[in-house]
Amino acid sequence: MMTGTIETTGNISAEKGGSIILQCHLSSTTAQVTQVNWEQQDQLLAICNADLGWHISPSFKDRVAPGPGLGLTLQSLTVNDTGEYFCIYHTYPDGTYTGRIFLEVLESSVAEHGARFQIP
C-alpha cells in the first residue's frame, strides 16, 4: 500500500531573467527513493538516480543546476518557462509518486537573481 505523500512548492512565480528552485518532498513512507525525474510537461529536464547521480538533459544543461538535495534550480528564466513541472519519485517497494508545481514567469523591468549558484 502506498502511504507516502508528496509536498511541493505548489504554484510559484519568478521574474524573467531570474532563478527559481523547484522542490518536492516525499514523506510518510519508509520506501527507499531510487530515482527522481524532473519533467516539464512531457519534456525531461533531469534525472537524479540513487546509484548514478544526476543527468541533466542536454537542452537544459546551461541553465539548470541540480540541487539542493533532490531539487532542481532553473536560471535565466524566460516567459516560455511558464507551465507545469513534475517531480516523479520512483520508490521501492511503494512505486511511483508524482508532485506538480506550476511556475509563472513574470515580465519585469528589473530581473532579480535569487539563486546562489553561477554557471560561467
Epitope: 547521480g53 543546476a65 540541487g67
Partner: antibody, heavy 117, light 107 residues
C-alpha cells in the same frame, strides 16, 4: 569502486595560497556535486562549498567566498580547491566528498594544511 | 542559513546500551537531513540519508527518524566500533550546513 584521492599534507606561510586536488575514479565525475568540508583539530565539520562538473555550477558558504575557489578539470576527473591569503585559522584538514542528491556518500581521506611562519 | 543544533555534546554509554542522538534545525527542513559517523583520524561516513533511509553496508542497528525541525539518530545496542563523533547535515537549502556533533564515548 568509487575513490576520492586527495593531495598530501601542505605547509604554507601566512599570506600564501595553496591549491589542493581531489581525483575521482570509479564513477561518472560529471554526475555528482563535489563538496569541500573543513575540519579544524578537535572541531566539527564546516561546509565550504560545492562544484558541479556537469556544467560548472558552484555554491559557496558566504564565509568562504573570497577565501576558497572551486574548480575542476572534467577530462582528468579532478576537482580543485584554492585557498588564498592564508592565516592560522586556515590550518585544518580539508575533505572532498561527492553528492548525487542522496547525501555525501563517499569522502576523500582528507588533506592537511598547516599555516605557520 | 539553517543552523543545526546537536545534543548532547557528549554521550557516555556502555556497550549494549541503546542510545538516541538529537539534531534540531532552526527552521523546517522537511526530511532533508543526513547523518554521518566519524571515527578518530578517519573521514566521515554516511549512515542515514533523508532522515530515515538506510544506507547499504551500514548495520541495521542504526536508524533515523524525524521531520521538520526535530530529528533523532538511534543506535540499538551500541557496539565498541560505534564510538566516535556523529554529525547531522541538511540539504534542504544552500548553503548546506552541519551540526556541531555529538561525541559517543565509552562510559
Amino acid at each position: 569502486e568509487v575513490q576520492l584521492q586527495q593531495s598530501g599534507t601542505v605547509l604554507a606561510r601566512p599570506g600564501a595560497s595553496v591549491k589542493m586536488f581531489c581525483k575521482a575514479s570509479g564513477y561518472s565525475f560529471t554526475s555528482y556535486w563535489m563538496h569541500w568540508v573543513k575540519q579544524r583539530p578537535g572541531q566539527g565539520l564546516e561546509w565550504i562549498g560545492a562544484f558541479y562538473p556537469g556544467n560548472s555550477a558552484t555554491n559557496y558558504n558566504q564565509k568562504f567566498k573570497g577565501k576558497a575557489k572551486l574548480t575542476a578539470v572534467t577530462s582528468a576527473s579532478t576537482a580543485y580547491m584554492e585557498l588564498s591569503s592564508l592565516t592560522n585559522e586556515d590550518s585544518a584538514v580539508y575533505y572532498c566528498s561527492r553528492e548525487g542528491g542522496y547525501g555525501m556518500d563517499h569522502w576523500g581521506q582528507g588533506a592537511s594544511v598547516t599555516v605557520s611562519s | 542559513d539553517i543552523v543545526l543544533t546537536q545534543s548532547p555534546a557528549t554521550l557516555s554509554v556502555t556497550p549494549g546500551d541503546s542510545v538516541s542522538l538529537s539534531c534540531r534545525a532552526s527552521q523546517s527542513i522537511r526530511n532533508n537531513l543526513h547523518w554521518y559517523q566519524q571515527k578518530s583520524h578517519e573521514s566521515p561516513r554516511l549512515l542515514i540519508k533523508y532522515s530515515s533511509q538506510s544506507i547499504s553496508g551500514i548495520p541495521s542497528r542504526f536508524s533515523g527518524s524525524g521531520s521538520g525541525t526535530d530529528f533523532t539518530l538511534s543506535i540499538n545496542s551500541v557496539e565498541t566500533e560505534d564510538f566516535g563523533m556523529y554529525f547531522c547535515q541538511q540539504s534542504n537549502s544552500w548553503p548546506y550546513t552541519f551540526g556541531g556533533g555529538t561525541k559517543l564515548e565509552i562510559n
